[in-house]
């Protein structure tokens, strides 16, 4: 079976690499525009230049193209803690990232949020914080892990999953209460 190609891919595949088929005349292959530029006018004929113009400030194209407009530069999301790593140029979109000692949590493919790396207080670092993953902590005795923080077993309710980890402490508390009744 031949994979189904979109009209644009079908048209482009007729021309050699780096060229595209003229939208009004399928016997003409025009040279694509370089990155940092966009298509202002198709080439008038074979062997003639495509009219490409540089992207205006606030827009870019990152690869050779025959786009009628440049793409708008992304803005880093301050409300998500993002900072600008590098500014947008005519041939490269803005690069956003996180500050030092922070990691990215991806809510979706194109939305990440910056959070502080856990310090593992009352525990030890099992895996160091990485660009896309928080520190993995192992808690000291008498503490259990809740939302990647080591919390005292005195905060462990019987209904929570911490009961297994905090079982000796819970038994001790129960025993102390029981021994008070004679």
């Amino acid at each position: 079976l031949v994979p189904h190609l979109g009209d644009r891919e079908k048209r482009d595949s007729v021309c050699p690499q780096g060229k595209y088929i003229h939208p009004q005349n399928n016997s003409i292959c025009c040279t694509k525009c370089h990155k940092g530029t966009y298509l202002y006018n198709d080439c008038p004929g074979p062997g003639q230049d495509t009219d490409c113009r540089e992207c205006e400030s606030g827009s870019f194209t990152a690869s050779e193209n025959h786009l009628r407009h440049c793409l708008s530069c992304s803005k880093c999301r301050k409300e998500m803690g993002q900072v600008e790593i590098s500014s947008c140029t005519v041939d490269r979109d803005t690069v956003c990232g996180c500050r030092k000692n922070q990691y990215r949590h991806y809510w979706s493919e194109n939305l990440f949020q910056c959070f502080n790396c856990s310090l593992c207080l009352n525990g030890t670092v099992h895996l160091s914080c990485q660009e896309k993953q928080n520190t993995v902590c192992t808690c000291h005795a008498g503490f259990f892990l809740r939302e990647n923080e080591c919390v005292s077993c005195s905060n462990c309710k019987k209904s929570l999953e911490c009961t297994k980890l905090c079982l000796p402490q819970i038994e001790n508390v129960k025993g102390t209460e029981d021994s008070g009744t004679t």
Epitope: H105, W107, S108, E109, N110, L111, E147
Partner: nanobody, 116 residues
Framework: EVQLLESGGGLVQPGGSLRLSCAAS????????MHWVRQAPGKGLEWVSG????????YYADSVKGRFTISRDNSKNTLYLQMNSLRAEDTAVYYC?????????WGQGTLVTVSS
């Protein structure tokens, strides 16, 4: 058409509680992470909390951690924010938001005023 409708705001005394709700329609609610974002008078937007598609993970801004709880009911297409131990600095318009697709979608907001 995506619609987000917040409710539950109002005037509350410091130390009091409120529960905000957000009714969602026009998209598959259970397929999307959801967020609460607020804007205090004369200030910029501040992300408050977010929740994953199935109710996990949940994240909170440091300023509300331990006081606010985000939850969702996918069968009712509703997002919630339980706010306890409210402080004057929590006074803001609270927006329910679907973020991160080709477009962001916001509700019209609900005003929370914390004052004695």
């Amino acid at each position: 058409e995506v619609q987000l409708l917040e409710s539950g705001g109002g005037l509350v005394q410091p130390g009091g509680s409120l529960r905000l709700s957000c009714a969602a329609s026009g998209f598959t609610f259970g397929d999307e992470p959801m967020h609460w974002v607020r804007q205090a008078p004369g200030k910029g937007l501040e992300w408050v909390s977010g929740i994953g598609k199935e109710g996990q993970p949940t994240y909170y801004a440091d300023s509300v951690k331990g006081r606010f709880t985000i939850s969702r009911d996918n069968s009712k297409n509703t997002l919630y924010l339980q706010m306890n131990s409210l402080r004057a600095e929590d006074t803001a318009v609270y927006y329910c938001a679907k973020l991160g697709g080709p477009f962001d979608y916001w509700g019209q907001g609900t005003l929370v005023t914390v004052s004695s």
